[in-house]
């Protein structure tokens, strides 16, 4: 055709996949009558008639475009709906009168790819690989035309680098005509890449301009040999007996080597392997002073069979030995003096304190306690506490009982007890003295004795309340080598009109079940005895 070489460049129409392309026939009135036009699609230089316009009326030709074409804009524009990548071609309109002229339109089709899917090598990358390894893949699905991929490491674009970085991209055409791009990043990584953030970016074009989509950032498992092995002890700081102590091996390699922990035998000075748990941790629970010593860790790389040894670490489990008090069982006469001395060993400086056991009162700060002009009340428990001030909770104690010679001393001299006839009464009587007294009762019943401490005794008696008992009352007598003493319990019948017994009679430690009212230091348990059998 003459003059074909001078054909003007086709008009460019850009649309996204799935939208409608408006193909406007650009013939001027002088070039042709738009009421009489033929539309063609050009594919591989082959023209195919797809649409006719006659007297302003449009008619699709049978074929792939039959259902998707319609006339718009009073016949000047051909609308192509549901655009696909296969529609990217030249369309031309040809006017028939007064002479044949044509106008060409280049349809460009675009589709944004899906979000890039990045995947990391699930097995990881060894730093000593001989060739670049597959680090990650980036897949951009269903884009058109083929998007461009850029790989980033720590925010910087990665460039091809011989024997170091290689980017291998390939694409497949889906049945839809859309492209799926797969890019594989191959690289030789170094130890420092263990924390590196990689991502890929897809660059693509739409009618609106250039766009990009980024994948999520990923880190790559990097394997590198161990160069250093060391020990770590938890808790940090001063350790004491009774603590839970964990000794673990650590290494700067990935994966870590196989660990073993050894302790130096103080007598042979040989390293002896300790038993660790499944995680390779040596747990000392409870820690004892014998656990003190020199520990070291060995890391064995099972691939290379290279063994590394840690710096030895000295472990000190602080302790306080058993506390010794002298004299151990002191006995003194009233009015005399007594010196109590406390001793203990420790891995640290010790502080001593003397406390009165019964009250918790601090009597002395120091290992020696001096007691002068001893009274009977000075008898009882004294506790020495040996502690390490620099390590809270590290202390040991020893209790010593001071005995003051003297006859029995009663907790009360006399007391009134409210009772009901036929009830079982539970009475108690307490006495102290040195030597420790024994208690006897003046009535028959079930008596039991409990030693409260080396100088004190408590006796309880279960007895049935009878008229005779109400008359005589009950006496308890405490006796030792140095004398005897008595307490009297007066029994009074509870009268229903009696509201409150005389309050000054309810002192002391005797307990009874007689009173319906609660008394300080008294308990009551009432039990009905079976009626006696009647004999005919």
């Amino acid at each position: 055709v003459p003059g074909e070489a001078e054909q003007p460049a086709p008009e460019l129409v850009e649309v996204e996949v799935g939208s409608t392309a408006l193909l406007k026939c650009g013939l001027s009135q002088s070039q042709g009558n738009l009421s009489h036009v033929d539309w063609f699609s050009v594919h591989k230089e082959k023209r195919t008639l797809i649409f006719r316009v006659r007297q302003g009326q449009g008619q699709s030709e049978p074929g792939e475009y039959e259902q998707r074409l319609s006339l718009q804009d009073r016949g000047a524009t051909l609308a192509l709906t549901q655009v696909t990548p296969q529609d990217e071609r030249i369309f031309l309109c040809q006017g028939k009168r007064p002479r044949s002229q044509e106008y060409r339109i280049q349809l460009r089709v675009y589709k944004a790819p899906e979000e890039p899917n990045i995947q990391v090598n699930p097995l990881g990358i060894p730093v000593n690989s001989k060739e670049p390894e597959e680090v990650a893949t980036c897949v951009g699905r269903n884009g058109y035309p083929i998007p461009q991929v850029i790989w980033y490491k720590n925010g910087r674009p990665l460039k091809e680098e011989k024997n170091r970085v290689h980017i291998q991209s390939s694409q497949t055409v889906e049945s839809s005509g859309l492209y799926t791009l797969q890019s594989i990043l191959k690289a030789q990584l170094v130890k420092e890449d263990k924390d590196a953030q990689f991502y890929c970016e897809l660059n693509y074009r739409l009618p609106s301009g250039n766009h990009m989509k980024e994948s999520r950032e990923v880190t790559v498992p990097v394997f590198y040999p161990t160069e250093k092995v060391w020990l770590e002890v938890e808790p940090v700081g001063m350790l004491k007996e009774g603590d839970r102590v964990e000794i673990r091996c650590l290494a700067d390699g990935n994966p870590p080597p196989h660990f073993s922990i050894s302790k130096q035998n103080p007598s042979t000075r040989e390293a002896e392997e300790e038993t660790t748990n499944d995680n390779g941790v040596l747990v000392l629970e409870p820690a004892r002073k014998e656990h003190s010593g020199r520990y070291e860790c060995q890391g064995l790389d099972l691939d290379t069979m290279i063994s590394l040894l840690s710096e030895p670490q000295e472990l000190l489990v602080n302790y306080v030995s058993d506390v010794r008090v002298s004299p151990a069982a002191p006995e003194r006469q009233e009015g005399s003096s007594l010196t109590l001395t406390c001793e203990a060993e420790s891995s640290q400086d010790l502080e001593f304190q003397w406390l009165r056991e019964e009250t918790g009162q601090v009597l002395e700060r120091g290992p020696v306690l001096q007691l002068h002009d001893l009274k009977r009340e000075a008898g009882g428990g004294y506790r020495c506490v040996a502690s390490v001030p620099s390590i809270p909770g590290l202390n040991r104690t020893q209790l010593v009982n001071v005995a003051i010679f003297g006859p029995p001393w009663m907790a009360f001299k006399e007391r009134k007890v409210w009772v009901k006839e036929n009830m079982v009464l539970n009475l108690s009587c307490e006495a102290s003295g040195h030597p420790r007294p024994t208690i006897s009762w003046n009535v028959n019943g079930t008596a039991s004795e409990q030693d409260q401490d080396p100088q004190r005794v408590l006796s309880t008696l279960n007895v049935l309340v009878t008229p005779e008992l109400l008359e005589t009352g009950v006496e308890c007598t405490a006796s030792n080598d140095l004398g005897k003493n008595t307490s009297i319990l007066f029994l009074e019948l509870v009268n229903l009109t009696t509201l409150t017994p005389d309050s000054n009679t309810t002192t002391g430690l005797s307990t009874s079940t007689a009173s319906p009212h609660t008394r300080a230091n008294s308990t009551s348990t009432e039990r009905k005895l079976p009626e006696p059998e009647s004999r005919g």
Epitope: Q119, V120, P122, L123, S129, E131, E133, V139, I184, K186
Partner: antibody
Framework: QVQLKESGPGLVQSSQTLSLTCTVS????????VSWVRQPPGKGLEWIAA???????YYNSAFKSRLSISRNTSKSQVLLKMNSLQTEDTGMYFC??????????WGQGVMVTVSS | DIQVTQSPSLLSASVGDRVTLNCKGS??????LAWFRLKRGEAPKLLIY???SLQTGIPSRFSGSGSGTDFTLTITSLQPEDVATYFC????????FGAGTKLELK
């Protein structure tokens, strides 16, 4: 087309060493990695070991101390050695091609029986 | 290690049925999941990779979906040749397989 074929002894005595070969065609071992996977009778699949296109080797930590994987690129073969065999190692052993991280082609498998 | 749990372990269905198999990861594996079909005496066959990509040559009645921890393999119209054991596999960190779903005809 891509093909993988496993070969090796059908019967092995316990405590002995198992040697399996995976012969590949239709691709190069320097382009794709290869994994070994096994399936004990009536059980699921279990990944054993892999060799990457770059020649790096990887092992399932459950077997690591008794495994060795290697390749002969000129013969297009991947070799797996497993020592100290027990009866629990009985099963079907497969080799599979990496693409690059999932397995796109597998061999038909070789049945290995460990007898006591 | 990442665990992969498959359900159900056994599934009976009729020809033409829509069949759904499930796979659950013990942690987020994004889309690093593949589905395989295993028939006795045959090489295992890759059906789906990257959670939802259909492997070349696999009929379009197979489809995969899901991301993160929950994944599904769907067969829209069950065919007699689909009777097999189906496995899912994660390749996000190491390689682990589900215990399998045995699919049989009613």
């Amino acid at each position: 087309q891509v093909q993988l074929k496993e070969s090796g002894p059908g019967l092995v005595q316990s405590s002995q060493t198992l040697s399996l070969t995976c012969t590949v065609s239709g691709f190069s071992l320097t382009s794709n990695g290869v994994s070994w996977v096994r399936q004990p009778p009536g059980k699921g699949l279990e990944w054993i070991a892999a060799i990457s296109s770059g020649g790096s080797t990887y092992y399932n930590s459950a077997f690591k101390s008794r495994l060795s994987i290697s390749r002969n690129t000129s013969k297009s073969q991947v070799l797996l050695k497993m020592n100290s065999l027990q009866t629990e190692d009985t099963g079907m052993y497969f080799c599979a091609r990496h693409r690059p991280f999932y397995f796109d082609y597998w061999g038909q498998g070789v049945m290995v029986t460990v007898s006591s | 290690d990442i665990q992969v749990t498959q359900s159900p372990s056994l599934l009976s269905a009729s020809v033409g049925d829509r069949v759904t198999l499930n796979c659950k990861g013990s942690q987020n594996i994004y889309k690093s999941l593949a589905w395989f079909r295993l028939k006795r005496g045959e090489a295992p066959k890759l059906l789906i990779y990257d959670a939802n990509s259909l492997q070349t040559g696999i009929p379009s009645r197979f489809s995969g979906s899901g991301s993160g921890t929950d994944f599904t393999l769907t067969i829209t119209s069950l065919q007699p040749e689909d009777v097999a054991t189906y496995f899912c596999q994660q390749y996000y960190s190491g390689y682990t397989f589900g215990a399998g779903t045995k699919l049989e005809l009613k």
